[in-house]
């Protein structure tokens, strides 16, 4: 019989108390095959968070700075559950700290130094951890003490709970610093207090605390937010501009063999019973006998945490950034306004080693990171263990919805103005065998489809989001009789035409034959009935163009594309004849790294783009034999985006609307993770 | 195809010198970029050190300041000079030129480094 019990880990006398309370309460009213709860009590959350790690206990709740503590090696401890705040139809897992300004001062992040700072308090998070961590590069040195480079970056603050005497810069905007809301100055209200009065020029505060304290709109305006970039926006968009958004209260555990599912169970079934509101006799989320007692008394609820979701990811790459730079305080020999090198994600191996050629040609200029799957390097970009790659429009939508940003794109015609005019898009087509002269769009049902990979455009969301219209169900393994798609669960009959050997069946990167658009069109070729792919695929690998075996004596006579109307048309019909306009490929980026990456990767086009005419004997970006490995093979450059900046400017309304209506389908497990950071 | 034969390897005590050599034949014509790659039992192969035809040259930061990687154009050779070797440096050593290994999956038989007193 499996052990059903959580030991949930108690920090006091007091906690202690309420654990055992909760566990005789849950015993009343869970069934005796259900979970239960046991205590088990340490002396300090550290302590706690050892005995997880070591198997002495399972769960205990945290905020945000000792999730980070939970994380670290040997640890490594996971986010499993999170506590909601407000209401259970719009429910608060995170805040935002953020930097308030008042509207005239027009000065930007980057020009803090000299300015009067007014702070929550000393070593509390919005107000000064996630501010004084991202500055901390920018910080005089010595940076130890930390208060006395704070004291000298500023020309005033107001930072309650400091040491007045050997800092007194820091209590210059309120004497003596006091460490209550004796202090005007104090917490959340008195750090926005000191900015209203005029005392300070930025307040290191929450999202919420502007509304708490101006009711009224018209004196809101008079207020902006300081965002990473250098620019400001008004309070209201602190979703787009603030300095870290920050879980509120979370319990963790282990990474391996963490019972995350019981947890789960157990904290789902008792926030049921003894939830807000929900009985007299046991309640979750109080504390008769102090404060906070194993979860927040403010909390109304608990929700679960994604299981792709690591404590990396749930803390967010800004406030990961502050807390590291805190503890190590480590910082560049000396910053300097030259860009690092570019650490661009290769899928697989065979990205990887066209990745390290680029990188010996680009000398050091661009450096190479590998991951198994194009969401692996999504979370990595989010991470910062790399910073740039060029995806499907499929995942420029997901990159997006993890916050990250388009930068340029593919563009495939030659045109005079190429780094400067980005194209509307491709044509996503499905290709059947001219012989097969029966096949329509509208009697696909049961037959063998070839696809470049779930997730992507031409090859998923285009041809299965127009499918789901049709049949309103997302079991597309039903719908074809078997096909390879890519990235599908391996046991579905949608790997089951897949050319993979062993675990690299059915997987999304170049280990799988069948794999992006050659790959499904080989499938096609070889055991398929219709191929979803880009309008330029069959023209790329018949008449001789592509060497391979299977490829060489193909003739682009023999295929045809399926239009919607139920007609078929020859294959250079596709304008005429294709299920929709896809947008182009995009390189995405952290939004800190736009610049950088736009700036080196327009210098590498110009050194390995289309300009070199022998690819035999040069390192060419843009090539590799049909492979599509790091950018497209016809692509001719990277183009500027103008104003299509955000992936739903970049993807277009249209576009995002069709993969929206597709996300109930989705299997994406990277989607669900940060639809949960941002829903 | 371009083929490839390493060799030079060896067991050498720590601190001590080694150098490679990698002489091609085939369909030279199309060489650009050659590197040399080292696996350590239970690990990924990893980029040790580069060089265009040019000659211009990267190397990995944990062999940067030990090790040198020239080529010769005229014999079809690139060369990994490895000084102040390390027990951590222990591994078979391939080179490569890029364009038959990533569209071919090419690799050569590799030589085998063994850094140990």
């Known amino acids: 019989v499996p052990d059903k019990t959580v030991r949930w880990c108690a920090v006091s006398e007091h906690e202690a108390t309420k654990c055992q309370s909760f566990r005789d309460h849950m015993k009343s009213v869970i069934p005796s095959d259900g979970p239960s709860v046991a205590c088990v009590k340490k002396a300090s959350y550290l302590d706690c968070i050892r005995a997880i790690a070591a198997n002495e206990a399972d769960a205990v709740t945290l905020d945000a700075g000792l999730v980070y503590d939970a994380y670290l090696a040997p640890n490594n401890l996971k986010p499993v559950v999170a506590e909601f705040y407000g209401s259970k139809e719009d429910p608060q897992t995170f805040y935002y700290a953020v930097a308030v300004v008042k509207k005239d001062s027009g000065f930007q992040m980057n020009q803090l130094r000299g300015k009067k700072s007014c702070h929550t308090g000393l070593g509390r998070s919005a107000g000064w951890n996630i501010p004084i961590g991202l500055l901390y590069c920018d910080l005089p040195e010595p940076r130890k003490p930390l208060e006395k480079a704070v004291a000298n970056f500023f020309s005033g603050s107001c930072a309650p709970c400091a040491d007045g005497t050997d800092f007194p810069q820091l209590c210059q905007l309120c004497p003596g610093c006091g460490c209550s809301t004796l202090n005007q100055y104090f917490g959340y209200s008195g750090a926005f207090k000191c900015l209203k009065d005029g005392a300070g020029d930025v307040a290191f505060v929450k999202h919420s605390t502007i509304f708490e304290n101006l009711a009224n709109k018209a004196d809101r305006d008079q207020y902006e937010l300081l965002c990473l970039d250098n620019t400001r926006k008004p309070v209201d968009e602190y979703k787009d501009c603030h300095l870290a958004q920050v879980p509120s209260h979370t319990v963790v555990a282990r990474s391996m063999g963490g019972k995350e599912d019981l947890i789960w169970e157990l904290l789902n079934q008792a926030q049921e019973h003894f939830g807000k509101d929900k009985s007299k006799e046991f309640q979750l989320f109080s504390s008769p006998h102090g404060k906070d007692l194993l979860f927040k008394d403010s909390a109304h609820g608990f929700l679960k945490v994604p299981p792709r979701m690591d404590a990396k990811m749930y803390l967010g790459y800004e406030y990961v950034t502050a807390i590291r730079n805190l503890r190590e305080g480590t910082c560049p020999e000396a910053p300097t306004d030259e860009c690092k090198p570019v650490k661009w994600c290769a899928l697989s191996h065979h990205e990887r080693l066209k990745c390290d050629e680029w990188s010996v040609n680009s000398v050091g200029k661009i450096e190479c990171v590998s991951a198994e799957t194009t969401e692996d390097c999504i979370a990595k970009i989010m991470n910062g263990e790399a910073d740039a790659m060029s995806l499907d429009g499929g995942f420029v939508y997901i990159a997006g919805k993890c916050g990250l940003v388009p930068v340029l794109a593919e563009n495939y015609n030659k045109s005079d103005n190429c780094e400067d005019t980005p194209e509307a898009g491709y044509f996503a087509i499905a290709v059947v065998k001219k012989s097969a002269s029966d096949l329509t769009w509208d009697n696909l049902k049961g037959k063998k489809s070839c696809h470049t990979a779930v997730g992507r455009t031409a090859g998923w969301n285009i041809p299965m989001g127009l499918l789901y219209n049709k049949i309103n169900h997302c079991r597309f393994d039903e719908f074809f009789s078997e096909g390879c798609a890519p990235g599908s669960k391996k046991d579905s009959s949608l790997c089951k035409l897949c050319m993979g050997s062993g675990l690299n069946l059915c997987e999304p990167n170049n280990k799988e034959g069948y794999y992006g658009y050659t790959g499904a069109f080989r499938c096609l070729v070889e055991k398929g009935d219709v191929a979803f792919v880009k309008h330029q695929t069959v023209p790329q690998n018949t008449g001789g163009k592509n060497p391979d075996p299977w490829a060489k004596n193909l003739n682009e006579k023999d295929y045809e594309l399926l239009c919607l109307d139920g007609t078929r048309k020859p294959v250079e019909e596709y304008a005429n004849c294709h299920l929709a306009r896809a947008p182009n490929h995009a390189v995405v980026t952290r939004k800190d790294k736009e610049a950088c990456v736009h700036k080196i990767l327009r210098q590498q086009q110009h050194l390995f783009g289309s300009n070199v005419t022998d690819c035999s004997g040069n390192f060419c970006l843009f090539r590799s034999e049909t492979k599509d490995l790091l950018f497209r093979d016809d692509t001719v450059c990277l183009a500027k985006l103008h104003d299509r900046n955000t992936y739903e400017k970049y993807l277009g309304e249209e576009y995002v609307k069709a993969v929206g209506n597709l996300r109930k389908c989705s299997t994406s497990s990277l989607l669900e993770a940060c639809t949960f950071r941002r829903p | 195809q371009v083929q490839l034969v390493e060799s030079g390897g060896g067991l050498v005590q720590p601190g001590g010198s080694l150098r490679l050599s990698c002489a091609a034949s085939?369909?030279?014509?199309?060489?650009?970029?050659m590197a040399w790659y080292r696996q350590a039992p239970g690990k990924q192969r990893e980029l040790v050190a580069g060089?265009?035809?040019?000659?211009?040259?990267t190397y990995a930061g944990s062999v940067k300041g030990r090790f040198t990687i020239s080529r010769d154009n005229a014999k079809n050779t690139v060369y990994l000079q490895m000084n102040g070797l390390k027990p951590e440096d222990t591994a078979v050593y391939y080179c490569?030129?890029?364009?038959?290994?990533?569209?071919?999956?090419?690799w050569g038989q590799g030589t085998q480094v063994t850094v140990s007193s």
């Open positions: 060089i265009t035809r040019s000659g211009t040259t």
């Open positions: 085939g369909s030279i014509f199309s060489i650009n970029t």
């Open positions: 490569t030129d890029y364009s038959s290994s990533y569209y071919q999956d090419y």
